[in-house]
Amino acid sequence: ITQQDLAPQQRAAPQQKRSSPSEGLCPPGHHISEDGRDCISCKYGQDYSTHWNDLLFCLRCTRCDSGEVELSPCTTTRNTVCQCEEGTFREEDSPEMCRKCRTGCPRGMVKVGDCTPWSDIECVHKESGTKHSGEVPAVEETVTSSPGTPASPCS
């Protein structure tokens, strides 16, 4: 996911003023004016705000990266929602990119969970049912696996 327009000082002139702040705050979809007297609408498809706020600038919409699909567009009150394309997933500890899901489990293991946009396939040992925590171990023969994935131990 990338941020649009990362040079805030180049930001275009604000849109028309809509309302006065309530107790110093502006409603979702707006930001506060430079003198604090007005609430200014965010620009649809460009920026947004999700809560009552005293932000001087609306938050810039994120754009979905290649390898992601847009589930819902950016509106003045909600950021873009992006999701990894089918066959790829994003891990919590590396959210900056979508990684290819493995195509199969290591020898002696069975698949118990499918590839989702949020998780790789899940494999367990046939006998013990112990989950495999990561990708294919280097020492073990594999059924099929995606290239370039580091080895990790079973749990």
């Epitope: 805030p8 110093g24 932000l55 001087l56 938050l59 810039r60």
Partner: nanobody, 127 residues
Amino acid sequence: EVQLLESGGGLVQPGGSLRLSCAASGSTFSSLDMGWFRQAPGKGREFVSAISRSGDNIYYADSVKGRFTISRDNSKNTLYLQMNSLRAEDTAVYYCAVDSQPTYSGGVYYPRYGMDVWGQGTLVTVS
């Protein structure tokens, strides 16, 4: 508790320049997101400029864009505002402020009108 002390104000002719400084103490300066505001005689507080702790995100009010430049020196615990091409309407008390509840989204800092730690201000008169 952070303390802020502005300096550099004074009387200047239209078209002239001034450089304001804001020395901060009592906190880790490099962790502070900061800004400049001003208040003209008989008017309310107005946002001038803001800068993130790293200096990567910089914002200006439309009225000063292209004339004022905000910067910071984290090694000197000092925030600056270089003001060029000054106009009569820039006459105001200039305040340095700290955003103690900063908003970050996607790694980008967004300043608030309600910055909550203030210096005592320095008067700039353009006449």
